[in-house]
Every structure is written in C-alpha cells, then in structure tokens.
C-alpha cells in the first residue's frame, strides 16, 4: 500500500507566439483545479478507459481576474497535493492523465461552469521510495509543470511497496540513511543506486547497479533513441546494437490477463476483458468492494459491501463493460437507415440523412408525399402509412395551419435562450457556444 | 438497481424550515456529485445545490445562496438539504440527483441537469404565506 502525490508547481500560457493571455477576464473571473487519472502499465491513455490505479480531484485554486495591460502571470493553483491511494503493489510502469479545469465564476447562464482548459497524458516509470520527478508537459498553447513521486505507507518498503518493513527494538546496526527490515536481523534498507551514468529521463532500475530503458530508448546507458525506420517487425524488446525492435512473441501470447481474463490485440499493446470482480490493465486487482470505486465513468455501485460479495456497475448511457470502462460505439449497430450516415456526439446519436428522406433515424422517404397539402410552407414526411406535416417555424398542427411557438420546441442548444421572432425565433447562445441554434 | 430516495418534505409556514434526506442504496458515491434539483408545476427543473463528497466542492443557486445548506454523511451514503426561510416561491417537487462530468466532457455544469444520470422519485415541498 502506499500513496501517489502530484504536486503542481505551474500552469500558464507556453513558450512562442500564439500563446493565450489567461484563461480568466475581468468579465469571467475564474480559478483553476484539477483532475489526475492514473492507469497500471503502458496502458492505452484514452480518458474514458478506467483509471485502476486511482483519480483524485483537487481542491480549487484561489479566485483569478486578469489585469487589462499586465503581463500574463503563471496563474494562480490550488493549495496542497493531488494524492491517489493505491492498496496494493505499486507497478513501476503507469500511465497518466492530468486535467486542468476552469471554475468560471461570472454571471452564467445556468449557474457556475465547468470547462477543460488542458488535458495531457504520459506514460512513466516510477519506482516507489524514489525522488520527486519533475515533468513539463505542453497541451496546445498551455504548459503545465509538476512533479510526482510514489511513497509507500508503513510498513510496507521497497520499489514495489510489497516488502514489509519495521524498525527493530534493538539499537540499529544499519549506517547513515539507512533502516533496519525485518524479517532479517541484519539485512538493511538501502535506497536503490543505478548503474552509473544511467540516464535518468530515459533509464530506471529494478535492482543496485542495473540500467533498463523506457520505451523508445536503448543503449547501455538508455540514450540512442530507439530508430525503426530500417526494422522489419514492429514486435519485441529493442536490441541495444541496432536500436532496433527484434520480433518477438505476441503481447497476447502466454496470456497476460489473470484471473480467468481474456485478452485481445490492440495496435499498440493488448486489452484484458476481465470478468467482474477484477480490473486493471492485466485483470490483477481484486478483493474490489464498492467503497474501491470500482465504477468508472459515472457509473454506480450497488452491493459489494464487503470483499467476498459482489457488486454490480450500473452504467451511464454510452459506456458497457462490468467497471462501465468500455464507451459504446452506437454506430456499430448501423441505426440510421436508407443509407443514413451515423454520428455520435457522444451526448447523443445524430443521423445525417440521404436527399429524399428525413426523420431522426432517416427512416421517412419523402418521396410518398406527393399530393400530400402542408400549408404555410410544411414539408410532408411519410410515417407508418400516414403522412404528416413537418411545419415551418412558426406554425403547427395536423397541416401547418394553426400558429405556433417557434420556442416550444426548445430548439436552441446548451442552455440557449429561444426568442420567438416575426421571421421565426433566435437563439441566445450560452458562454463558449455559437451557431443558429447554439449546436456548436 | 439503483435507488436515490428523498425524505422529508412537507408543508411549511413561510419563513419555517425543512431538512430534506437523500438516501443512496448500494452503491458509495465519492467520486460523483450528489445534487438537489426543483421543479414547480409548468417550470423547468432547476438545480438549487450539489456537493462533491471527495473535495467537499459546493455550488448554491444564487435563489437560495445563505438560506440553504447541502451537507453529507459519506457513512450513512446520505446528502442532506437544510432549507431555512422557506417562502412561497419555494413550493416545487425536489428531486436528488447523482452524477458529474461525463468522460472526454470539455464543459460541464453543476447545477444543470445533463451529466447527472440518477434521479430519485421527489418529495413535495409547500411553503404557504
């Protein structure tokens, strides 16, 4: 067991022209915080795959107005560190994702908003016990600066947090800087020394004296950047003469995922499906109660209040999978029909139609209106055997010939305001929105 | 199943007080928002306060900002509404709701509807002058 700690030392505009001023106005005071999502292994760094290794949410950082002629500042960040909780080993290799959120604090249509100024993601090598790590990472024209290390919670030692660790009753015998650990008498806790001249962006190390790379990197010493320009297999451990990969066996080959799961290629590594009860990138983590948080994406926990039952996620719609950390792709099911392209939004389905028909799964030919009277400039659509009329704006009924309230209809998008017009209705868009009917 | 269960509402002289309960079966809610909507007869649902237990982040609409109070009791999985000089326009069905930012969202806000995918049964509220 043991605790991730991030600590944010800096977010403002990057380096070069084209950089914002601040993400705050004298019109929309705002302040920032942030979010940390962190993933076992190299693993994918989609935001919606499950952060099995914990997120945490930062408290929000002190109110920011930006001075009209001052020069941009870095801006003003929460106090404290992000800390995520991790239970059970640390896994030396994690991914990660960092997001920074606006609280904008002027008058809202709607109340106080939420919107993501930067997200960035990374993959690292981490041993516990270690320094501090600083990073600098850049998301367009942001930059963030931070640093991260992993500590293990007594008693608990060691790169992995897996070895337990208690001062003994007798004097120590251990030298400066380091402690005793039992379960052996005189066996001491050193802190971890690579072998020298390791690179220490690119290099890391298990055990005293050893120097392995990070992906992308190679040599003795982790500093010739890995070239695959002149290899043959995209597969395998790279090889320290050629900087190249050498084949090697498939990332689902002997089976990676525990506990019964089954695992399937992806481009880049593989994908464990795990059965519930277990998640993490290789399946691994289990005993999950529902106090883990074991439901990503706004999904809910029911039952599991103890390890030995189970619980159950009831997923949000759009997400599948018994942690909820599968985002559906709608799309595959080809609900649109005569040819209707699909798009989901996301927050919704939408089907863009082939001239001739029309209605939200494209399913009415228009072409069967024919004959068919709509008054007032209404377009007949088919439905069922019998037609209807689809109204202009402005009118309603059977035939479009009965007035009616363009606004009814809600028809402007996020939170827009809809102002009924002699010539139809306008929509006021909500901060950070625009078009006709506020869709974008 | 999911279940979002509200109590404690009732009739009320103008001027009185009223705690509302939201009781979350099964499920522990520390990464979601817990939120208090309203909704009074021919007007759209509006939402009035929501926490986040995790940070204990608070947001009050500015109709019931230094009357009301939303509170938690992470142990009991209850959110609470402590509503002191009810007034007439009070009057509505309240609803508890669970939910927050969806994934890959880039806008959000916390007293609107859209992001929060659980919702209670309601319990009425009616404040009379």
């Known amino acids: 067991a043991g605790v991730f700690e991030l600590q944010i030392h800096s977010f403002g505009p990057g380096p070069g022209p084209g950089a914002p001023r601040s993400p705050c106005s004298a019109r929309l005071p705002c302040r920032l915080f942030f979010r940390v999502c962190l993933k076992p292994g190299l693993s994918e760094e989609a935001a919606e795959s499950p952060c099995a290794l914990g997120a945490a949410l930062s408290a929000r950082g002190p109110v920011y107005t930006e001075q009209p002629g001052a020069p941009a500042p870095d801006l003003p960040l929460p106090d404290g560190l992000l800390q995520v909780p991790f239970r059970d080993a640390w896994p030396g290799t994690f991914s990660f994702i960092i997001e920074t959120w606006r609280e904008e604090l002027g008058d809202q249509i709607g109340g106080p908003a939420w919107s993501l100024l930067a997200r960035v993601a990374g993959r690292r090598r981490l041993a516990a016990g270690g320094p501090w790590a600083r990073d600098i990472q850049r998301a367009g024209a942001w930059e963030l600066r931070f640093s991260y290390r992993a500590r293990c919670e007594p008693p608990a030692v060691g790169t992995a947090c897996t070895r337990l660790c208690r001062p003994r009753s007798a004097p120590s015998r251990c030298g400066p800087g380091l402690r005793p650990c039992a379960p052996l008498e005189d066996e001491c806790e050193a802190p971890l020394v690579c072998r020298a001249g390791c690179s220490p962006e690119h290099g890391f190390c298990e055990q005293p004296g050893e120097c392995r790379c990070l992906e992308g990197w190679t040599g003795p010493l982790c500093t010739v950047p890995v070239s695959t320009s002149s290899c043959l297999s995209p597969r395998g451990p790279s090889s320290a003469t050629t900087g190249c990969l050498v084949p090697g066996p498939g990332p689902c080959d002997g089976n990676p995922c525990a506990n019964g799961g089954s695992c399937s290629e992806t481009p880049r590594s593989f994908e464990c499906t795990c059965p519930r009860g277990f998640y993490g990138l290789r399946c691994e983590v289990s005993g999950v109660t529902c106090a883990d948080g074991p439901c990503f994406n706004g999904g809910l926990c029911v039952g599991g209040a103890d390890p030995d039952s189970a619980y159950i996620c009831h997923c949000p719609p759009g997400f599948q999978g018994s942690n909820c950390e599968k985002r559906v792709d709608r799309c595959s099911l080809q609900p649109c029909r005569n040819g209707g392209l699909c798009l989901d939004l996301g927050h919704a389905l939408r089907c863009r139609c082939r001239a001739g028909f029309a209605g939200p799964r494209c399913e009415h030919d228009l072409d069967d209106c024919a004959g068919r009277a709509c008054a007032n400039g209404g377009t007949c659509v088919e439905g069922g055997g019998a037609h209807r009329c689809s109204c202009a704006l402005g009118f309603g009924g059977r035939d479009c010939r009965e007035r009616a309230d363009p606004c009814a209809a809600r028809p402007c998008a996020h939170g827009g305001r809809c102002y009924a017009h002699f010539s139809g209705l306008v929509c006021a868009c909500a901060p950070g929105y625009m078009g006709a009917r506020c869709e974008f | 199943q999911v279940h979002l269960m509200e109590s404690g509402g009732g009739s009320v002289q103008a001027g009185g007080s009223l705690r509302l309960s939201c009781a979350a079966s099964?499920?522990?809610?520390?990464?979601?928002?817990m939120g208090w909507f309203r909704q009074a007869p021919g007007k759209e649902r509006e939402g009035i306060a929501t926490?986040?237990?995790?940070?204990?982040?608070?947001y009050y609409a500015d109709s019931v900002k230094g009357r009301f109070t939303i509170s938690q009791d992470n142990a009991k999985n209850t959110v609470y509404l402590q509503m002191n000089s009810l007034k007439p326009e009070d009057t509505a069905m309240y609803y508890c709701a669970a939910g927050g930012p969806p994934a890959n969202a880039d806008r959000w806000y916390p007293l609107r509807p859209p992001g929060y995918n659980y919702w209670g049964q309601g319990t009425q509220v009616t404040v009379s002058s």
């Open positions: 099964g499920y522990t809610y520390r990464s979601n928002f």
């Open positions: 926490i986040h237990s995790g940070v204990a982040t608070t």
